[in-house]
Interface confidence: low
Amino acid sequence: DFTPTAPLASYPQPWLGAHPAAVVTPGINVTLTCRAPQSAWRFALFKSGLVTPLLLRDVSVELAEFFLEEVTPAQGGSYHCRYRKTDWGPGVWSQPSNVLELLVTDQLPRPSLVALPGPVVAPGANVSLRCAGRIPGMSFALYRVGVATPLQYIDSVQPWADFLLIGTHTPGTYCCYYHTPSAPYVLSQRSQPLVISFEGSGSLDYTQGN
């Protein structure tokens, strides 16, 4: 079991990013870029939990690109990278980079949609709807059933988005989606519909089928 010996202060961690995105549909070509804070000689890419070997790139600059062609769902997972310099001695690598979660899927998991403080509100009161997925950095859209275009659209750094509904037009049935913020777009399943009603008005069910 070989453990890297690089102290944190000496060999700072590199940064690992994905292009065009870390969430993609199958068949897309993905480039993982490992960027070192200093010029490096060799970069290595690792995937957690697989016996597959590391990917190596010999370069003499600050970054290395690892090409994953026509990715499959199996190539999704947790990746990290390290770098080394020729004068570090055998087996001495940098600290690991940030962990990059690559998700390869045709459809993102269904978000939840909940009302805060609850789905029954006083007439004229505002209500906040939280659409929550599991992946940060997505674009969220809130729909009212029967209306074709989104009511609201939020780019969120969190794995959720809070939509504020103002006053008298609140009652109705709502659902939400989320998707990757840039192409190639990957869309989530639709949330379960959520009925919002005024106190004392009964639960008007505006729900329509899928």
Epitope: R42, L54, T72
Partner: antibody, heavy 117, light 109 residues
Framework: EVQLLESGGGLVQPGGSLRLSCAAS????????WTWVRQAPGKGLEWVSG???????NYAQNFQGRFTISRDNSKNTLYLQMNSLRAEDTAVYYC???????????WGQGTLVTVSS | QSVLTQPPSASGTPGQRVTISCSGS????????VSWYQQLPGTAPKLLIY???NRPSGVPNRFSGSKSGTSASLAISGLRSEDEADYYC?????????FGGGTKLTVLG
């Protein structure tokens, strides 16, 4: 020139132990995933164990507990410690270097292990 | 018994095209890469194809690999007498490397 040279094979009695070595030359040993593959007489190839650059070694189910893979990066050498040997462990043992994206691109010539009383 | 299934034997005459199949499952071939090896009698295996369809330098373009779903195949065109050997497919799952049982290729005539 890239070369792998296995050694340590030979005749051993059932229940005995043996340590195989694989000396590598021609590239940076510490940068690669190394593995042992065996081939019983007249049979196919069977993966035994692998040693990644970072993290724990991994083993085929049949060998977990009996065999131990290790590496000495300063000596450019891979090892396989084999304990509680059985007649069915008789095989040629190859060491191989793993390439990208999951193949064995360089093989040694193999060393024969015979387990017999 | 191997997790990856190959026919035990195949044959062809010089100049012919021969295909060797390798069948697995979604946990190995279906979601991972396939490699092919040639083993001449009394020698170590030699890498023929990696990453489903790539040839290492020095391997003639008579050898080609492909993958579809949970199966892969090795094609040898313009068969020659020196192609007589054992051929193995190889893939992996989340915890181990896997080999097919091997196919003995005989070049007739």
């Amino acid at each position: 020139e890239v070369q792998l040279l296995e050694s340590g094979g030979g005749l051993v009695q059932p229940g005995g132990s043996l340590r195989l070595s694989c000396a590598a030359s021609g590239f940076t040993f510490s940068d690669y995933y190394w593995t042992w593959v065996r081939q019983a007489p007249g049979k196919g190839l069977e993966w035994v164990s692998g040693s990644p650059v970072f993290g724990a070694a991994n083993y085929a189910q049949n060998f977990q507990g009996r065999f131990t893979i290790s590496r000495d990066n300063s000596k450019n050498t891979l090892y396989l410690q084999m304990n509680s040997l059985r007649a069915e462990d008789t095989a040629v043992y190859y060491c191989a270097k793993a390439g990208i994206p999951g193949h064995f691109d360089i093989w040694g010539q193999g060393t024969l292990v015979t387990v017999s009383s | 018994q191997s997790v990856l299934t190959q026919p035990p034997s195949a044959s062809g005459t010089p100049g012919q095209r021969v295909t060797i199949s390798c069948s697995g499952s979604s946990s190995n071939i279906g979601n991972n890469y396939v490699s092919w090896y040639q083993q001449l009698p009394g020698t170590a295996p030699k890498l023929l194809i990696y990453g489903n369809s790539n040839r290492p330098s020095g391997v003639p373009n008579r050898f080609s690999g492909s993958k579809s779903g949970t199966s892969a195949s090795l094609a040898i065109s313009g068969l020659r007498s020196e192609d007589e050997a054992d051929y193995y497919c190889q893939s992996y799952d989340s915890s181990s490397w896997l080999f097919g049982g091997g196919t003995k290729l005989t070049v007739l005539g």
